[in-house]
Amino acid sequence: YNNFRKSMDSIGKKQYQVQHGSCSYTFLLPEMDNCRSSSSPYVSNAVQRDAPLEYDDSVQRLQVLENIMENNTQWLMKLENYIQDNMKKEMVEIQQNAVQNQTAVMIEIGTNLLNQTAEQTRKLTDVEAQVLNQTTRLELQLLEHSLSTNKLEKQILDQTSEINKLQDKNSFLEKKVLAMEDKHIIQLQSIKEEKDQLQVLVSKQNSIIEELEKKIVTATVNNSVLQKQQHDLMETVNNLLTMMSTSNSAKDPTVAKGEQISFRDCAEVFKSGHTTNGVYTLTLPNSTEEVKAYCDMEAGGGGWTIIQRREDGSVDFQRTWKEYKVGFGNPSGEYWLGNEFVSQLTNQQRYVLKIHLKDWEGNEAYSLYEHFYLSSEELNYRIHLKGLTGTAGKISSISQPGNDFSTKDADNDKCICKCSQMLTGGWWFDACGPSNLNGMYYPQRQNTNKFNGIKWYYWKGSGYSLKGTTMMIRPAGF
């Protein structure tokens, strides 16, 4: 009866063909291939991307949809015009031919066309709705992308300003470093110059010291010669006086015995008959060198050579190696006899060492070592002690075995610090040890919790600075 055929042409339009008898009607309608089919749903709440989607692509698609809409509208209008024209022609023809059944066919065709039109219209409405949805979605996407872009731009600006700040800071620091380097170079140069000047000065001082030492030696020799001459003269005068005072009738005129003129220690002085406390001149055997020492002729049988005394803080004990070597202070008051003399003396025979101590509360104590000697200067006057007795502690406050002697300019202790500088005074420091009788002198009520006082730990404990100390030696067999 009637036959519908649907096919595709080269430009992608749908071709509708109606065949009826000798008449055939062909309608070309556009296909909505670019539209999203309703079977593929659009997810509106998808995760927002950081970078925009292909913006141009979306715009193109939108334009294509608009074009399709326009085309569809035009086609509908043409179709309506065409149907109207056709209907008119057909009606004229039917009237002319008066063919009754042809009218029925035309009405059927018209109906089909109207149905087709309605279908197209419905499809177009759907497309229009889809286009609106798509447009809204695209607008939202564009807004999101715009926000994202703004955010990124802000971040970039922030980072750029941060980079600029860092670059400024870096250049400032570079300048500062360069300035410091320049300053450092200048300082090094000035230090080098000062060092050179000091070296020149030191060498000059060394030569002056050498000359002075030579002069001292000469003066000492001259002095001893003069003393001998003086002694000889005195002896001669005494002899003459004795001879003159002796009557002519005397059968055996006697010459007064010449007294022993040199004593090595106070024990010899005591044995020679001088039994009163006081300052005496001592001389080592086979030596012209003399030292003035205080002799205690009363304590414990007498004959004690005082090698150290502290009593009132009148003498500074923060002295150099050389001063501790030769001695310093006042023998009738505070003094240090001298390491060289004591070393030589205690290596000639066996000596005992007695240390007498006084606190601020009126108490007294002592430590007695039955054997004491000092090594030579080459061995830093190391102290050697044996056999402790006494009331100033059962344990020796002078570290055992003995340590080398240290002064402010000769660090021979076992400490990572410099004990002589930290605790003041020269002593046989350990690290730094339980004693220092050459520390700072502190008066009463200021003598506790002291880090650098006159210390004898095993009697008064740490931090207690004593009122008085005396170190004395005497031959072991006295």
């Epitope: 400490c415 990572i416 610090c417 930290m422 690290a431 040890g433 002291k450």
Partner: nanobody
């Protein structure tokens, strides 16, 4: 003048805790080591713990390891001894004392008692039920 003042002692039951404080004046903790010592009746004074604030080093006697903790607050010039799991044998007078941080023998880490020259008056800790 250097002063050390202990506080925080008292009576506590076995297993209990106490925190002793040692307030130091006249010196800065950066240059000194502070030690805690104790002396029980009829016994010698013994070292308990010590701290060197400059390097953050600490020392503990074997008898208190794991129970006592020493710490310092340099801004307050104060050293603390936190004592936990106390035992009756911890009963003693506790003293804090100071020593110049540099007064160390080569190769040694800590100081003999006689090197501590500044002492506090002590605070009594009694551990008894």
């Amino acid at each position: 003048d250097v002063q050390l003042v202990e506080s925080g002692g008292g009576l506590v039951q076995p297993g209990g805790s106490l925190r002793l404080s040692c307030a130091v004046s006249g010196i800065t903790l950066d240059d000194y080591a502070i030690g805690w010592f104790r002396q029980a009746p009829g016994k010698e004074r013994e070292g308990v713990s010590a701290i060197r604030s400059s390097g953050g080093s600490t020392y503990y006697a074997d008898s208190v390891k794991g129970r006592f903790t020493i710490s310092s607050d340099n801004s307050k010039n104060t050293v603390y001894l936190q004592m936990n799991s106390l035992r009756p044998e911890d009963t003693a007078v506790y003293y804090c004392a100071a020593v110049p941080a540099g007064r160390l023998r080569y190769g040694e880490q800590w100081y003999p008692i006689y090197e501590y020259d500044a002492w506090g008056q002590g605070t009594l800790v009694t551990v008894s039920s």
